[in-house]
């Protein structure tokens, strides 16, 4: 599920407040009715919108996957913020999954950066100080590098 999935709302529930659009747009936390005459509030914890918009449906809240922790819940104006669990990280070029951080550096290298939710440990060559891309674990280590569970995109929209 991505934050861009539609959250269908065929009928307006009693708790969903209506107001009039301004300049044809509805405020954050709302979507517009099909005829463009009403702004309908998103449902807290279920869907959201972050900007003034004319979306026909609010955007479905992201659910954090196993392997992720929820930093902040979904509100009507902001998507859920999920973060990889301790010991795992999510790379920018593969945001769909949390991967396990390596437990150590290859032989001849030293650790200069810790595992964070956004990056693997950072290793540099002892002599030259050049960074290592991080694919090959040390020969004597048995570092598991199997990918974690796929993770939903978090709070960014658009």
């Amino acid at each position: 599920i991505t934050q861009q999935d539609l959250a269908p709302q065929q009928r307006v529930a009693p708790q969903q407040k209506r107001s009039s659009p301004s300049e044809g747009l509805c405020p954050p936390g709302h979507h517009i009715s099909e005829d463009g005459r009403d702004c309908i509030s998103c449902k807290y914890g279920q869907d959201y919108s972050t900007h003034w918009n004319d979306l026909l449906f609010c955007l479905r809240c992201t659910r954090c996957d196993s392997g992720e922790v929820e930093l902040s819940p979904c509100t009507t104006t902001r998507n859920t913020v999920c973060q990889c669990e301790e010991g795992t990280f999510r790379e920018e070029d593969s945001p769909e999954m949390c991967r396990k951080c390596r437990t150590g550096c290859p032989r001849g290298m030293v650790k200069v950066g810790d595992c964070t939710p956004w990056s693997d440990i950072e290793c540099v060559h002892k002599e030259s100080g050049t960074k290592h891309s991080g694919e090959a674990p040390a020969v004597e280590e048995t570092v598991t590098s199997s990918p974690g569970t796929p993770a939903s995109p978090c709070s960014l929209s658009g």
Partner: nanobody, 126 residues
Framework: EVQLLESGGGLVQPGGSLRLSCAAS????????VGWFRQAPGKGREFVSA????????YYADSVKGRFTISRDNSKNTVYLQMNSLRPEDTAVYYC???????????????????WGQGTLVTVSS
Amino acid sequence: EVQLLESGGGLVQPGGSLRLSCAASGRTFGSIRVGWFRQAPGKGREFVSAINRNDGTTYYADSVKGRFTISRDNSKNTVYLQMNSLRPEDTAVYYCAAGLQYNRAADRVPVGAVYWGQGTLVTVSS
């Protein structure tokens, strides 16, 4: 899920014309307004034009006013961008967008969008 499919890009000489199409596959564009953005090589994404599918109200960036015309055919679930008097500086990847996002209600220029097409390349060169 909202999917936007652009077509009509290509190579054209300065002063020439092209018509881009944006079709919503599936049931909906997901919003009332549909727009076009463009991204020139090495530059950020820039708003070009938008149209309100309900009443046909149109919006244009100053750089394309008088040269580009946006229109819609609701029966075909398609939005068009007619580009005339093309200039080399119009060279860019053109993206169809829906669910346009604005910082304020009175803003005429959206800051982004929820739904994006894959883009179609327009090259203006002699």
